[in-house]
């Protein structure tokens, strides 16, 4: 190798300076007994290059570039070489931002996959490889004392969201979770939350479906439907708050919201409803009085009202 | 302090009827699902019955369908479970249990047996 | 109903071993699987909950794992007051059914 460039930093701040140097040493004098270094950032050259010849022989050239732009580029420096230029050596410069802050970061706990899944906010694009990781801890208190560390929990790239299994969690007891973003330039870490992760739980919503009609109950009335809903078992001893959500088949009618029922109600009559008409209805649940999340809506049930003998289609579908 | 107090077992005969009550105290009883859990002697636990927070679910044990019925007092804070046509084989130590968000029995009485013999 | 199979159905240790009780379920339970410990003539006990949580006020030896259908319970250094009879159940579905019971006992 005939020359070497070294930089003052590989990676900068995208639009801060960067001075590298180059130096060819005295064995290789004989291309030029002054050879010119020439630099060239990608396909451009520079100029402004500082060439000096050192006290062992050896040449040296100093760039300062005022404003690295690039988020990516080679630095070579070079030697005129006949009609042709010869590079000596070159280096990959990357320019950047630090991480910002990641926000907006919540977590919901699905009992059915027995995790608690959290997903956050990364920030402005920060043009350098940047990694986020997911820290926890398990407190007693209000997580102002820290107790046994989490394994942290690594998202696949490109993905803003992290599960933490079952058996890194503790539930009813608080634990500290917060994102940490870290990338050559810098690290930051968001606000930490301090949740249970029981007070984040996500259900499972009920099933609808038709009341089966019983010889001595009376039919719904006109403009009336007859539904029942079957919990979610294994959500079954959470204490539950449902709203349905209904609107006609045809037209376009937005959702209509009545709530909130019980969930051990278990069956309802809906009336205020269009005679002869094709209704689709969806229901979904909440942990209450204690903190949850809503479920998911249910798949629909598509029901008809009736002005004399109920009749029905079942028809589900997830939306 | 946090506890479950069964009464109302004692010696039925066959065909016979018991109500059984559960006392608590304690916790905020109406936020929670109950239960009944027996223990034939010598043998291992079997659920008998639950009943939700306000009391409109009530799921039994196909052994025990049709003959007892569960039910709650919120305003007393008390559990009972109605045991008719009694059997032989529905003799055993009765627990009344508070059962947790995820179906654990997190709080256990101390148990009151029925016997049934003629 | 969801059957609970329990095994072994009883087993001899010494104080100080690891006792391991493996639990069965017919169909998949997810994590809806819990632990109890009963003495004689006394209610039982919850150990563990949701598979892995140890109940407040229950040693760190006991501790339990497994999802879907298959369940441990792992006693890491068995002590005087351990010996007793342990019991799983599932809260997955209704019924809430038990494992027949496995007795642990003084070698």
């Known amino acids: 190798e005939c020359g070497h460039i070294s930089v003052s930093a590989p990676i900068v701040h995208l639009g801060d300076p960067i001075t590298a140097s180059c130096i060819i040493k005295q064995n290789c004098s004989h291309l030029d007994p002054e050879p010119q270094i020439l630099w060239r950032l990608g396909a451009e050259l520079q100029p402004g290059g500082r060439q000096q010849r050192l006290s062992d022989g050896t040449q040296e050239s100093i760039i300062t570039l005022p404003h690295l732009n690039h988020t990516q580029a080679f630095l070579s420096c070079a030697l005129n070489w006949g009609n042709s230029l010869q590079i000596l050596d070159q280096v990959e410069l990357r320019a950047g931002y630090p991480p910002a802050i990641p926000h907006n970061l919540s977590c919901l706990m699905n009992l059915t996959t027995s995790s608690l899944i959290c997903q956050w906010e990364p920030g402005p694009e920060t043009h350098l490889p940047t990694s986020f990781t997911l820290k926890s801890f398990k407190s007693r208190g209000n997580c102002q004392t820290q107790g046994d560390s989490i394994l942290d929990c690594v998202p696949k790239d490109g993905q803003s969201h992290c599960s933490i299994p079952r058996k890194h969690l503790l539930l009813y007891q608080n634990m500290g979770i917060w994102v940490q973003a870290e990338n050559a330039l810098g690290t930051s870490m968001s606000p930490q939350l301090c949740l249970d992760p029981m007070d984040v739980v996500k259900l499972e919503p009920p099933m609808l479906r038709t009341m089966d009609p019983s010889p001595e109950a009376a039919p719904p009335q006109a403009g009336c439907l007859q539904l029942s809903w079957e919990p979610w078992q294994p959500g079954l001893h959470i204490n539950q708050k449902c709203e349905l959500r209904h609107k006609p088949q045809r037209g376009e009618a937005s959702w209509a919201l009545v709530g909130p029922l019980p969930l051990e109600a278990l069956q309802y009559e809906l009336c205020g409803l269009l005679p002869a008409t094709a209704y689709t209805l969806q229901i979904r649940c909440i942990r209450w009085p204690l903190p949850g999340h809503w479920s998911d809506w249910s798949p629909s049930l598509e029901l008809r009202t009736t002005e004399r003998a109920p009749t029905h289609h079942h028809h589900h579908h997830h939306h | 302090e946090v506890q479950l107090l069964e009464s109302g077992g004692g010696l039925v005969q066959p065909g016979g009827s018991l109500r059984l009550s559960c006392a608590a105290s304690g916790f905020t009883f109406s936020l929670y699902w109950m239960g009944w859990v027996r223990q034939a002697p010598g043998k291992g636990l079997e659920w008998v019955s639950s009943i939700s927070s306000s009391g409109g679910v009530t799921p039994y044990a196909d052994s025990v369908k049709g003959r007892f019925t569960i039910s709650r007092d919120n305003s007393k804070n008390t559990l009972y479970l109605q045991m008719n046509s009694l059997r032989a084989e529905d003799t055993a130590v009765y627990y009344c249990a508070k059962l947790g968000e995820l179906g654990m029995y997190d709080l256990w009485g101390q148990g009151t047996l029925v016997t049934v013999s003629s | 109903d969801i059957q609970m199979t329990q095994s072994p159905s009883s087993l001899s240790a010494s104080v100080g071993d690891r006792v391991t009780i493996t639990c069965r379920a017919s169909?998949?339970?997810?994590?809806?699987l819990n632990w109890y410990q009963q003495k004689p003539g006394k209610a039982p006990k919850l150990l563990i909950y949701y598979a892995s949580n140890l109940q407040n006020g229950v040693p760190s030896r006991f501790s339990g794992s497994g999802s879907g259908t298959d369940f441990t319970l792992t006693i890491s250094s068995l002590q005087p007051e351990d010996f007793a009879t342990y019991y799983c159940?599932?809260?997955?579905?209704?019924?809430?059914?038990f494992g027949g019971g496995t007795k642990v006992e003084i070698k």
């Open positions: 169909q998949g339970i997810s994590s809806y």
């Open positions: 159940q599932q809260s997955w579905a209704y019924g809430l059914s």
